[in-house]
């Protein structure tokens, strides 16, 4: 025996209260596949979420984050505040990277400048809060096992970032 509900297309549900008639999904609900016995509630894009695609009877709404926030998680399930390059997000807000660290993204955390001297190179371009140092050619007089004559940049060990 074929299940009568299998004939109900997407956008409808099999209504047990009405002799398994295919009824349209009520407002603010959807069914993306046929044969459903209930319709799912549409996702609401509220607060820091904004609507990227409206809900229809056959597909859920899609959200993204309002300007100043970025998506995390499947289907943009979370929004996290952006900062500027050269900053990192703490509970007290966006804080500048400490000296010797940088962040070239609007999200994430600061990380230490590369220590050019570890590879026997010199600093060609100094680092900033937004950019890593650029390492240049090998330091004069460098050979493996000897230290660089260039004053080393801060080692790539994390410093204490501001809270």
């Amino acid at each position: 025996l074929q299940d009568p509900c299998s004939n109900c297309p997407a956008g409808t549900f099999c209504d047990n209260n009405r002799n398994q008639i295919c009824s349209p999904c009520p407002p603010n609900s959807f069914s993306s596949a046929g044969g459903q016995r209930t319709c799912d509630i549409c996702r609401q894009c509220k607060g820091v979420f904004r609507t990227r695609k409206e809900c229809s009877s056959t597909s859920n709404a899609e959200c993204d984050c309002t300007p100043g926030f970025h998506c995390l998680g499947a289907g943009c399930s979370m929004c996290e505040q952006d900062c500027k390059q050269g900053q990192e997000l703490t509970k007290k807000g966006c804080k500048d990277c400490c000296f010797g660290t940088f962040n070239d993204q609007k999200r994430g955390i600061c990380r230490p400048w590369t220590n050019c001297s570890l590879d026997g190179k010199s600093v060609l371009v100094n680092g900033t809060k937004e950019r890593d140092v650029v390492c240049g050619p090998a330091s004069a007089g460098f050979s493996p096992g000897t230290s660089s004559v260039t004053p080393p940049a801060p080692a790539r060990e994390p410093g204490h970032s501001p809270q």
Epitope: L72, A74, R111, Q163
Partner: antibody, heavy 116, light 108 residues
Framework: QVQLVQSGAEVKKPGESLKISCKGS????????ISWVRQMPGKGLEWMGK????????NYSPSFQGQVTISADKSISTAYLQWSSLKASDTAMYYC?????????WGQGTLVTVSS | DIELTQPPSVSVAPGQTARISCSGD??????AHWYQQKPGQAPVVVIY???NRPSGIPERFSGSNSGNTATLTISGTQAEDEADYYC???????????FGGGTKLTVL
């Protein structure tokens, strides 16, 4: 869609070396931190360390510093966790996860069994 | 590094409120996040940044964080909420993430 796919289960003997992998897809792999998390049988989650694949900068939990090595190859969007000499106490499920504070995507886990 | 302490187990009757605590020195100065893990599965975020709920997580999940304690609250607990729950925080001192020991929630 974003996915982290880990290499398969491993059975090893004490003293052997091992390198497990975590391949990211569906996002800019180079610009998101990847963390590794250990879960010993019947126990809780332990954060081991993280890597920024863009420049391979790593940072370890003090408990795991010197015990494991985390690396990445951004050209193939893959992060690695490796041991030079396994111990029986390394038997655990190992997860990779995207992020450094909020872990929004997780791999399926790699079960590592170390037994003589 | 900060240490996060959770009760090993919490039991609750269906429909009642479950509260899971996570204590650590001045955890309120950092963001706390909460993960749910069911047997054989990877963890899933249920609360992030102290009190924010990802879409797809039921409204009965809520969080708070101040002083030395972060709390995950599940109002009207359902059988499907039975799982292990872990708090975590990222500390800028040491640049590390720490997980609590985990709490097994049993729905009676």
């Amino acid at each position: 869609q974003v996915q982290l796919v880990q290499s398969g289960a491993e059975v090893k003997k004490p003293g052997e070396s091992l390198k497990i992998s975590c391949k990211g897809s569906g996002y800019s792999f180079s610009t998101y931190w990847i963390s590794w998390v250990r879960q010993m049988p019947g126990k809780g989650l332990e954060w081991m360390g993280k890597i920024y694949p863009g420049d391979s900068y790593t940072n370890y939990s003090p408990s795991f510093q010197g015990q494991v090595t985390i690396s990445a190859d951004k050209s193939i969007s893959t992060a690695y966790l490796q041991w030079s000499s396994l111990k029986a106490s390394d038997t655990a499920m190992y997860y990779c996860a995207r992020g450094y504070g909020i872990f929004d995507y997780w791999g399926q886990g790699t079960l590592v069994t170390v037994s003589s | 590094d900060i240490e996060l302490t959770q009760p090993p187990s919490v039991s609750v009757a269906p429909g009642q409120t479950a509260r899971i605590s996570c204590s650590g020195d001045n955890i309120g100065d950092q963001y706390a996040h909460w993960y749910q893990q069911k047997p054989g599965q990877a963890p899933v975020v249920v609360i992030y940044q102290d009190k924010n709920r990802p879409s797809g997580i039921p409204e009965r999940f809520s969080g708070s964080n101040s002083g030395n304690t972060a709390t995950l609250t599940i109002s009207g607990t359902q059988a499907e909420d039975e799982a292990d729950y872990y708090c975590s925080t990222y500390t800028f001192v040491g640049f590390t993430t720490v997980f609590g020991g985990g709490t097994k929630l049993t729905v009676l």
